[in-house]
């Protein structure tokens, strides 16, 4: 069930020095300050649970305020190997090396970690985002160029006494932030090596990590305002479901997205929203302070529990899935973008979901915990929730088995 007893020393309690160590906003990612090299070079690094490389800008780029200068580091070691990472849109490429890395507002340790020095990129860095690199916190299986490149967190755990666990509290502002406000704002917390009780309310509920590559989980049921979408649960996880702090939206497989939008439209039919709103193209606006949150439904995702035939649900509010956007042309209004979108690579529980919850990536016990975040945006009538247990049968059938293309698995 919720498993509130302490496991090992240092796993729980207060991590004051790490609280509020993240900045940013959901649309452009959350970043932590890190130092690389000797003497230390300070960089802001995007926290990304959807990838596994530690990669930093290492050459001038129009969108970077600063970058890693390897030639200035006495502890840099060249691995004499290149790395190329293409995305559906865009790419980055660079040179692999190792150097000393620490997190000023993290555990008081320094580790030698693999670093991809990005020398060329396209559609990777974001103008005005204020981060210069990415910290991939997922598993070695998805590291580039291959799984032999040890990810940062693995190096951290191996070289120190930091427990094999981290937790994230991403705090959506609930209102748009301009550039100066972002620089001054608190974006949340990354607690390395433990769980901080002050960052959540209620109990933590855990779902198994299905496979250690992405942080893959299994969704067993979806409800819109308590109404079951009634789809074969395999559809919810086609071809996988992952928890990804580096993605803005809640992304859903095509069929699930269409069913969810149909249901959200029906629930909010007192107003007629343009088709472009559901596509994420058009904003919708209301006179400042009059956003009718009540006309939008809550969305519940039921996740496989730790006990056989037991699940729990996480429920988000429109305050999470309607993302505030500042537009000078409509500045007298509160304007929002629909932050649920279609995916061809499975469900992605991005910042839209994570901003409602304190999320524990308990790698040691191969599970992910969810509790209601102490900083989530809500109103006086509804709040995000994590509730259970619920009885759900045949949950294993909800997982999709990606066909193996590896030649070693083919019959001869």
């Amino acid at each position: 069930e919720t498993d509130e007893e302490p496991e090992e020393p240092g796993r729980r309690g207060s991590f004051v020095e790490m609280v509020d160590n993240l900045r940013g906003k959901s649309g452009q990612g959350y970043y932590v300050e890190m130092t690389v090299g000797s003497p230390p070079q300070t960089l802001n690094i995007l926290v990304d649970t959807g990838s596994s490389n530690f990669a930093v800008g290492a050459a001038p780029h129009p969108f970077l305020h600063r970058y890693y200068q390897r030639q200035l580091s006495s502890t840099y070691r060249d691995l004499r190997k290149g790395v190329y990472v293409p995305y559906t849109q865009g790419k980055w490429e660079g040179e692999l090396g190792t150097d000393l890395v620490s997190i000023p507002h993290g555990p008081n340790v320094t580790v030698r970690a693999n670093i991809a020095a990005i020398t060329e990129s396209d559609k990777f860095f974001i103008n005005g985002s204020n981060w210069e690199g990415i910290l991939g916190l997922a598993y070695a299986e998805i590291a580039r160029p291959d799984d032999s490149l040890e990810p940062f967190f693995d190096s951290l755990v191996k070289q120190t006494h930091v427990p094999n666990l981290f937790s994230l509290q991403l705090c959506g502002a609930g209102f748009p932030l301009n550039q100066s406000e972002v620089l001054a704002s608190v974006g949340g917390s990354m607690i390395i090596g433990g769980i901080d009780h002050s960052l959540y309310t209620g109990s933590l509920w855990y779902t198994p990590i299905r496979r250690e590559w992405y942080y893959e989980v299994i969704i067993v049921r979806v409800e819109i305002n308590g109404q079951d979408l009634k789809m074969d649960c395999k559809e919810y996880n086609y071809d996988k479901s992952i928890v990804d702090s580096g993605t803005t939206n809640l992304r859903l497989p095509k069929k699930v997205f269409e069913a969810a939008v149909k249901s959200i439209k029906a629930a909010s039919s007192t107003e007629k929203f343009p088709d472009g709103f559901w596509l994420g193209e058009q904003l919708v606006c209301w006179q400042a302070g009059t956003t009718p949150w009540n006309i939008f439904p809550v969305i519940s995702l039921y996740l496989m529990g730790e006990v056989t035939n037991q699940s729990f649900r996480i429920t988000i509010l429109p305050q999470q899935y309607l993302r505030p956007v500042e537009d000078v042309a409509t500045s007298q209004d509160d304007c929002y973008k629909f932050a649920i979108s279609q995916s061809s690579t499975g469900t992605v529980m991005g910042a839209v979901i994570m901003e409602g919850f304190y999320v524990v990536f308990d790698r040691a016990r191969k599970r992910i915990g969810f509790a209601v975040s102490a900083c989530h945006v809500h109103d006086e009538f509804r709040t995000a929730a994590v509730e259970g247990p619920f009885v759900t049968l045949d949950m294993e059938d909800c997982g999709y088995n990606i066909p193996q293309t590896d030649e070693s698995t083919l019959m001869t």
């Epitope: 452009q28 974001i126 103008n127 088709d275 193209e281 058009q282 904003l283 606006c285 000078v328 042309a329």
Partner: antibody, heavy 116, light 107 residues
């Protein structure tokens, strides 16, 4: 200040193609879609299509699907429209516009003249 | 496609007058209508969104109203710089469509 800077006028021969550009500034480029529109004298404004700079997703007016191709270069915050197999019917003023609620920002216009 | 009809191509008015430009949608578009002003040889200038909301910086003599299929742009205390063309647009569904325009002229 939000600005959309369009490329200059084009004089092209029938059957040729042309690529118009629209450079955005003053806002986070990947946050808003860019649209392209056509205006011919006495025929009002026609919506050609749109592109999402964050992932290059495009949506076209069926009428222009075979005529226009939209692309984006985020490194320069520029959107492009390629018009192919030009005829006199394609002689028009073309605009890029940024989404928000409807089209709050417009480029300054590009005149395309198709003439032998 | 949704047809947006501005039945009057031209409207005569005088400086200081109040004038109403109308636009009719061929099907229900809710309040998802915008109005633009265009000086000949220039880009359209946005005036109204969501049928009745003024874009930032638009003078309050411009007022939008309507929902469903019938929409009106009212200009009170017409100024000489208002003697230009006005377009309505629906952004309720794709493809986005515009009215044919209404030109204000001096009586």
């Amino acid at each position: 200040e939000v600005q959309l800077q369009q490329s200059g006028p084009e004089l092209v021969k029938p059957g040729a193609s042309v690529k118009l550009s629209c450079k955005a500034s003053g806002y986070t480029f990947t946050n808003f879609w860019i649209h392209w529109l056509k205006q011919r004298p006495g025929q009002g404004l026609e919506w050609i299509g749109m592109i999402d700079p964050s992932d290059s997703y495009t949506k076209y007016n069926q009428k222009f699907k075979a005529k226009a191709t939209l692309t984006v270069d985020t490194s320069s915050s520029t959107t492009y429209m390629h018009l192919s197999s030009l005829t006199s019917e394609d002689s028009a003023v073309y605009y890029c516009a940024r989404s928000g609620v409807a089209f709050p920002y417009w480029g300054q216009r590009t005149l395309v003249t198709v003439s032998a | 496609d949704i047809l947006m009809t501005q039945s009057q191509k031209f409207m005569s008015t005088s400086v200081g007058d109040r004038v109403s430009v109308t636009c009719k949608a061929s099907q229900n578009v809710g309040r998802n209508v915008a109005w633009y002003q265009q000086i000949s040889g220039q880009s359209p200038k946005p005036l109204i969104y969501s049928a009745s909301h003024r874009y930032s910086g638009v003078p309050d003599r411009f007022t939008g109203s309507g929902s469903g299929t019938d929409f009106t742009l009212t200009i009170s205390n017409v100024q000489s710089e208002d003697l230009v063309e006005f377009f309505c647009q629906q952004y309720n569904s794709y493809p986005y469509t515009f009215g044919g325009g209404t030109k204000l002229e001096i009586k």
